[in-house]
């Protein structure tokens, strides 16, 4: 682990200390800047990122400190060692003095952050533009007007057809210079990310002709998440939400297409619920059926009246301190109408417990209740909108008879968690059950449903 | 008819800890259905919670205060105590002890103790 | 922490008016709001809980409202010995909260 850089294990001993960031938690590193100000944006250097972690899990929270002392969550971030990760902050609105970076990853480096200003912030009145100087590989011309002014674009018209040159950009501020930008290598009469057609052979998915991140195209031309790209050069759109369920979102968007059922799968939703807090004000019964797709799950949310109780159950009858001291246990029934051998349960979220008070991912409980009211447990899990609905695949023991399931417990231990549907996934047109009960000379017709009578034809 | 009834020194030096206790009588501070806190009131001004039991033991402090409060609970005494160290001037109040319910609001109330920090 | 701001800080009024006084929450704390009466050299005595509920044996003429970050306590009658100091206070989440207060004098 670098010097110059901070990770949570660089000061502990690998054999002697347990992982240095524990669920749920973790560390934080907190930093203060020189001047406080109102943001624009954060962008922050990650130089080392655990594979366990791949780029979701490791920076579980952000948070700016305000100087009028609130916390403002930014919340989990994607973040990759070979580009800085920049956070727009348009809707801050007041002047921040540091900043917190949760993680779980105690592996995880941190080599620097940036606060950038909004524009005219009055620390800026004595400074001086930037300008920038372009450096290639074969090296320039001389006569070459290399150091850009107010425009930022440079053209190069040395070029010869099939050449490789790689460009790099230094930043010039008075006397000082910048290190050289990372090196972008162009092969001249090919394509390239930025020229508005897609080369599906240097692994584009798309062009918009700009190197802006959140428009849809990445500055890899990469199709971003909740965006479809069509046409050259790209124009994308977040079809997300859009109320078209489209082919390639069928199984990514709830709010368009509904719950995805994959093929050779049937979804039940439940037919009844029974809960263990309930009023006029958070009845049970609002988690039979499917769950309404405007229902988006929210994260960090406090007060739970705000119109959830319509499409979610949630425990309104305790408050969350009483419940946190007291420990009390929640929970929740789901009967199906048709009993089946499960594939899968599946959890529909609108909140997932968590608060800004506490870094702690809410776990639920969930357990399989099955026609002879035996119970079999599926475990423990952690709740999160980033894994909504969440899909709980039941893995049945092949040396114990397989058994119909007729309804689905889940408890839980925060009022803070409100549950809009839970479904019981089984197979369709194939029961296990009546499979291994099926008698010498018999065979499962799936049309059935049933063990039918065969005889072999010689 | 619960009743609460809070005890302790009326003065204490800075930079000492303050002990204080609070007496149940009339039910059973083991009941699941509440919880147990102290509340301040400095002279004039308004009501800060300070802390809160179940009678399991398990807490949650004022994080304001977190570093110098300890609360703690004795059901075979129908007792839970408060202790806050390291008190300066800041700290002279009236010191009540209450009930919460699952609605976390305080429906019993100790006559209150004032507590004076000087030396 | 939740901040709970109340208004008025004091008010004037006479026998028999109606009284109202508000309190807002920084952030939406659901229904989990109480409020409470006290006088001086008292320990404060509850009026209502979850924001609408009127503890047992407090006079039918307080009564609470609100959800979410705005909250009502309302005297429909003052009657004299409802001159005193009026706390809203906020269960939604630790640390629990209190709004400064607003005293209720005689005009």
């Known amino acids: 682990s670098s010097v110059r850089t901070w990770s949570p294990n660089s000061a502990v001993n690998p054999h002697t200390v347990p992982p240095a960031c524990p669920e749920p938690q973790g560390c934080y590193l907190e930093l203060e800047f020189l001047y406080p100000l109102v943001p624009e944006s954060l962008t922050i250097w990650v130089t080392f990122v655990s594979t366990d972690w791949d780029s979701s899990g490791a920076v579980n929270d952000i948070k700016l400190l305000a100087v009028s002392g609130k916390n403002i969550s930014l919340g989990p971030q994607n973040v990759f060692c070979d580009v800085p990760l920049t956070i727009r902050l348009w809707d801050v609105g007041e002047e921040v003095y540091g900043i917190q970076i949760y993680t779980l990853d105690e592996h995880l480096e941190i080599d620097a952050a940036m606060l950038t200003s909004t524009a005219d912030t009055p620390l800026c009145l004595q400074c001086k533009p930037l300008k920038y100087k372009v450096v290639r590989d074969p090296p320039l011309q001389m006569d070459v007007a290399s150091i850009l002014h107010l425009n930022r674009k440079f053209v190069d018209m040395d070029l010869n057809l099939g050449s490789v040159y790689q460009y790099w950009v230094i930043t010039i501020s008075g006397t000082e210079e910048s290190e050289p930008s990372p090196a972008v290598t162009y092969i001249h009469g090919s394509g390239y990310c930025g020229d508005g057609i897609i080369q599906k052979d240097q692994g584009e998915q798309c062009d918009d002709m700009n190197k802006i991140n959140g428009d849809g195209c990445s500055l890899f031309c990469r199709q971003e998440v909740s965006f479809n790209c069509i046409d050259e050069p790209s124009r994308c759109y977040f079809h997300d939400g859009d109320g078209v369920c489209e082919e390639f979102e069928q199984k990514t968007s709830i709010k368009d297409c509904g719950v995805y059922t994959p093929q050779g799968f049937l979804d039940q939703w439940a037919s009844n619920a029974s809960v263990s807090h309930q009023d006029q004000q958070c009845p049970g019964w609002v988690i039979i059926g499917q769950p309404a797709a405007s229902q988006v799950c929210r994260t960090k949310v406090i007060d739970l009246s705000e119109g959830i109780s319509q499409h979610a159950w949630y425990p309104c009858t305790i408050s969350y301190p009483y419940s946190q001291l007291a420990q009390t246990t929640f929970w929740l029934r789901a009967y199906f109408s048709q009993p089946m051998v499960a594939a899968a349960v599946i959890v529909h979220l609108v909140t997932d417990g968590t608060y800004y008070g506490d870094q702690k991912q809410e776990t639920i409980s969930v357990q399989l209740l099955d026609t002879k009211d035996q119970s079999h447990d599926l475990g423990l899990h952690v709740l999160s909108c980033r894994n909504n609905p969440l899909i709980i695949p039941v893995v049945h023991d092949l040396s114990q008879p397989f058994y119909h399931s007729q309804a689905v417990r889940v408890s839980f231990s925060s009022p803070l968690v409100a549950i809009s549907g839970v479904a019981l996934r089984s197979f369709d047109n194939f029961d296990p059950v009546t499979l291994s009960s099926c008698q010498r000379g018999e065979t499962y017709s799936p049309a059935e449903q049933s063990c039918v009578h065969f005889a072999c034809e010689k | 008819q619960l009743q609460l009834q809070e005890s302790g020194p009326g003065l204490v030096k800075p930079s000492e800890t303050l002990s204080l206790t609070c007496t149940v009588s009339?039910?059973?501070?083991?009941?699941?259905?509440?919880?147990w806190g102290w509340i301040r009131q400095p002279p004039g001004k308004g009501l800060e919670w300070i802390g809160s039991i179940f009678y399991s033991g398990s807490t949650y402090y004022n994080p304001s205060l977190k570093s110098r409060v300890t609360i703690s609970v004795d059901t075979s005494k129908n007792q839970f105590s408060l202790k806050l160290s390291s008190v300066t001037a800041a700290d002279t109040a009236v010191y009540y002890c209450?009930?919460?319910?699952?609605?976390?609001?305080?429906?019993?109330w100790g006559q209150g103790t004032l507590v004076t920090v000087s030396s | 922490d939740i901040q709970m701001t109340q208004s008025p800080s004091s008010v004037s009024a006479s026998v028999g008016d109606r009284v109202t006084i508000t309190c807002r929450a920084s952030q939406g704390i659901s229904r989990w709001l109480a409020w409470y009466q006290q006088k001086p050299g008292k320990a404060p005595k509850l009026l209502i809980y979850?924001?609408?509920s009127v503890q047992s044996g407090v006079p039918s003429r307080f009564s609470g409202s609100g959800s979410g970050t705005d909250f009502t306590l309302t005297i429909s009658s003052l009657q004299p010995e409802d001159f005193a100091t009026y706390y809203c206070q906020q269960g939604n989440v630790p640390p629990l909260t209190f709004g400064g207060g607003t005293k209720v004098e005689i005009k």
């Open positions: 009339g039910g059973s501070i083991s009941s699941s259905d509440y919880y």
């Open positions: 209450a009930r919460a319910t699952t609605s976390s609001s305080a429906d019993y």
């Open positions: 979850a924001a609408s």
